[in-house]
Interface confidence: low
């Protein structure tokens, strides 16, 4: 069969499975005169043979793990043994079979994990090797936890990454592990080749002993600090401690106070830096943060609570320089004249702010002293001995001592004796007729003037008139302001008039005095007046129930999901049609009739959240008036962005030959939301075949170091694949490539002879 098993001498490649006894020839080379015989050289390993006539075969089973490629040369010789053709390269590629079992590098592993560690964050790696080809299932390893001891309530506290062997806590482990209850655990881990998918896979097991250590990164108890401390500052008030030394501590003032009187040192001790004033601020809440040397948070921040304890450092204060009360001539004994309300800035409902009232002087003392008394704790003044006569003494002045447990303050009260209120207010008109207004009349407009008079003593509470609308305006659309000099009442619009709900209103006013009428005198019809308000229709635009509508959905909701709804009403009762405006991303549609809003395309938080559009409500029919409101859609993050390199890393190079193993640092990022703690990426090599040459080690949640394992590199470009996992839910993995060039250097830079290829690396390591 010319061409498949025989033919002329030319470069050829053959693939042969390892471990199989020879069953057929490899190839029959045909000689072209003057060639008469063939010769085989190269990596024959005494396995490959060529007969003089050109028959190439092998005499025993191959082993890929000994040599995966045999580079042979075949030459054709003439009768004198001189090479007349060739030699040509013949490549034998040895194909892998699963003839090696995986083996753990250690029969026992030991590690420790801190309670409350983040679920999914590796704290220990087990590692197995398999001599078979990692590019085939034969060398693809699959790790599993066989058993966890002890197992409490059948709950797994630990998990393993099937591919990398990274052991981490489960969510339950993060919440429930407690060294006080159970300080140690044992795991039996198995590794299988064939990716764990075949019954014929080989396996190995190892034992992992895990110690659970206490997490001392805990919020301290709330602190109480007495205000106005005279001790030397700063004063230590509490402390936090990261689990390991070397953390960088800082405080975060979430309230953004103009004066933040706390500090933290690099031991984690928290201090108050100056005296506090409870009356300025009675409590502080701030956060303590621990960061690593790169400024990355090591864990969640701790909330620190400081309560400021009150001392009695404020005296009582009077409500005004002089407090004025009125009392009628005929008031009965015990009647209330008014209440003096003093203030104290110290803490409410404590002895520091509990006030006592006492009258220390009455002037004049006519017809006698002690005409008034004050309730000790309430501050209410009462008539104590007899009715007063204006013609004898029209005015009394009282000095009142107000005291807390340490301070005393004097307050002054003026009591005016006024004529008895025996005259009622009388309206000059009992009916103010009809008034017609459009429903869009401006708020604040005066629409009517009313007038009543009172014959009691002018400029006292007996003659002052207050107007009330007692009927016909349950919505409170109208109000009445009184001129204190003339007792004229001005009827004003306080809220918009509305033809649709109140086209005609029959309004009734009542005029009354702030002072009570004397016994036996009552308000009668003379103190009442009416008018009729007629409201005319104005076609109004629809009204939304809110200025801004807000909804919150996950960014991965299915297309067609209802994400929110808006509502508007037309004052005239017309139907409304809803539409959207400004949906620049084409994500939403609105039901014209119901106002329900649906997604019509995949949403993406990373494109911007909240997503803001306008909703328009338009009258159907009528004048087609419309109103606009805002709809804000807050998109909640899902882990839908794999990690990637934070910048372009082309141009990395090492000077060849390496004098010692070298390393370089790279940074990863992704576009998902990372709250206070930032991303927590894990890094590994992208394929098993890289492990002989390279090593990747995590520096922190975003940075890792790529190091060479030896110095024997060729002078060329290597593309190192790195696997970056974000540990999210679900975890996403990105495989990135770091191109690293090994090149001859001149003065620390890559040397390229003229005419060499472009793309000279620019970053030396």
């Amino acid at each position: 069969q010319e061409g498949k098993f025989s033919g002329p001498l030319k470069p050829m490649t053959f693939s042969i499975y390892e471990g199989q006894e020879p069953s057929q020839i490899i190839f029959q080379f045909k000689a072209n005169p003057p060639a008469v015989t063939f010769e085989l050289t190269g990596e024959t390993d005494n396995i490959f043979v060529i007969e003089r006539e050109g028959l190439l075969y092998y005499n025993r089973a191959l082993d890929r793990e000994t040599r995966s490629t045999h580079n042979l040369q075949v030459a054709a010789l003439d009768a004198n043994g001189i090479i007349v053709e060739g030699p040509v390269p013949i490549t034998i590629k040895v194909k892998d079979i699963n003839d090696n079992r995986p083996t753990f590098l250690q029969s026992k592993y030991e590690g420790s994990v801190r309670q409350n560690s983040r679920p999914g964050k590796p704290f220990l790696y087990v590692n197995a090797t398999d001599l078979d080809d990692p590019a085939t299932p034969n060398g693809q390893l699959y790790y599993q936890i066989v058993i966890q001891l002890p197992m409490i309530n059948n709950v797994m506290y630990f998990q393993i990454n099937n591919k990398t062997g990274a052991i981490s806590l489960t969510r339950e482990g993060s919440q429930e592990l407690n060294p006080a209850k159970n300080p140690s655990y044992n795991l039996v881990i198995s590794v299988k080749d064939m990716g764990g998918q075949s019954e014929n896979s080989f396996s190995d097991t190892t034992s992992v002993d895990i110690i659970v250590t206490e997490n001392i990164w805990k919020a301290p108890k709330p602190v109480e600090m007495v205000e106005n401390s005279t001790d030397p500052h700063p004063i230590k008030i509490t402390q936090v401690r990261w689990n390991d030394p070397g953390a960088q501590y800082s405080l975060v003032d979430k309230e953004k106070l103009p004066r933040f009187p706390f500090s933290i040192d690099q031991e984690g001790d928290i201090y108050v830096t100056q005296p506090l004033d409870r009356e300025e601020k009675d409590a502080y809440v701030f956060y303590a943060v621990a960061k690593d040397e790169y400024g990355k948070p090591l864990s969640y921040p701790l909330e620190i609570h400081v309560k400021v304890k009150d001392i009695n450092d404020n005296p009582p204060t009077c409500p005004s320089p002089v407090t004025v009360f009125e009392v009628q001539e005929n008031e009965r004994l015990g009647n209330s004249i008014g209440t003096l309300t003093a203030h104290d800035r110290d803490e409410e409902n404590t002895a520091n702010s509990f006030l006592n009232y006492r009258i220390v002087e009455q002037t004049p003392k006519l017809p006698m002293d002690g005409l008034f008394l004050i309730q000790t704790y309430a501050g209410m003044l009462q008539l104590a001995k007899q009715s007063l006569k204006k013609q004898d003494t029209p005015q009394y002045n009282l000095t009142i001592e107000v005291s807390d447990k340490d301070f005393k303050t004097l307050c002054f009260v003026q009591i005016n004796v006024i004529d008895i209120n025996d005259q009622i207010p009388i309206f000059e008109k009992s009916d103010y007729g009809n008034l017609t207004l459009a429903e869009d009349t401006n708020i604040g407009s005066t629409i009517l003037t009313i007038q009543a008079t009172d014959a009691d003593e002018p400029f006292t509470g007996s003659s002052k008139i207050l107007y009330h609308i007692i009927k016909g305006d349950s919505e409170g659309r109208l109000g009445v302001d009184t001129d204190p000099h003339t007792n004229t009442g001005y009827v004003i619009i306080k809220k918009p008039l509305d033809f649709e709900t109140a086209a005609v209103s029959n309004i009734v006013f009542k005029a009354e005095n702030p002072e009570p009428l004397v016994f036996g005198v009552k308000y009668n019809a003379s103190s009442f007046a009416k008018f009729t308000l007629i409201v005319t229709d104005v076609n109004e635009a629809p009204q939304f129930s809110q200025h801004v509508f807000q909804a919150k959905v996950s960014e991965d909701v299915a297309i067609g999901t209802k994400v929110g709804n808006v509502t508007a009403k037309d004052p005239e009762g017309l139907d409304i049609s809803y539409s959207l405006r400004g949906d620049t991303r084409g994500w939403l549609k609105i039901d014209h009739v119901t106002g329900e809003i649906f997604s019509v395309a995949p949403l993406d938080r990373e494109a911007g959240s909240p997503y803001r559009v306008q909703v328009v409500a338009t009258e159907v029919g009528g004048s087609s008036l419309s109103s606009v409101s805002e709809f804000h859609l807050i998109l909640m993050d899902v882990n839908d962005n794999p990690p990637r390199l934070a910048k372009d890393y082309t141009g990395l190079f090492f000077c060849h030959p390496l004098s010692a193993p070298g390393s370089l640092i790279f940074e990863a990022t992704d576009d998902d939301q990372h709250l206070f703690r930032g991303p927590h990426f894990t890094f590994s090599l992208g394929s098993g075949s890289l492990q002989n040459d390279w090593e990747v080690s995590k520096i922190n949640g975003t940075h890792a170091r790529l190091s060479t394992r030896h110095t024997e590199f060729e002078e060329r470009e290597y593309v190192v694949l790195i696997r970056i996992n974000d540990g999210g839910r679900p975890p996403l993995e990105g495989i990135v490539s770091l191109p690293v060039t090994f090149c001859s250097c001149v003065e620390g830079s890559c040397f390229r002879p003229a005419g060499h290829q472009t793309g000279i690396p620019t970053v030396g390591m």
Partner: nanobody, 118 residues
Framework: QVQLQESGGGLVQPGGSTRLSCVSS???????MGWFRQAPGKEREFVAL????????EYSDSVHGRFTVSRGNTQNSVNLQMNNLKPEDTGIYYC????????????WGQGTQVTVSS
Amino acid sequence: QVQLQESGGGLVQPGGSTRLSCVSSRTFSYYDMGWFRQAPGKEREFVALLSWRGNNAEYSDSVHGRFTVSRGNTQNSVNLQMNNLKPEDTGIYYCAVTYGVARSVRLWGQGTQVTVSS
């Protein structure tokens, strides 16, 4: 608003020296301070950087051994001592606050001119 204020520079003879200073209106924890420069018609390039603790300095290959970056009198100041100046050192020198190994610049100064010429 936080600002960076550079001073120093001017006209210098080849082989001569000058000193640039930069003061920030606030102190940055975990942020490094350093210098970049832009020669006429070229892109802005990294020159030198001092880590925020002041214990680690980095230099570009072109200035290594000639320039020294150091902390000023305060945590929020940085100096650049420039010796053995060459005409190719001519350009506008910018003070910057950077973060992390990627030297991502969070804040730029206004820049100060250095001209090396005889």
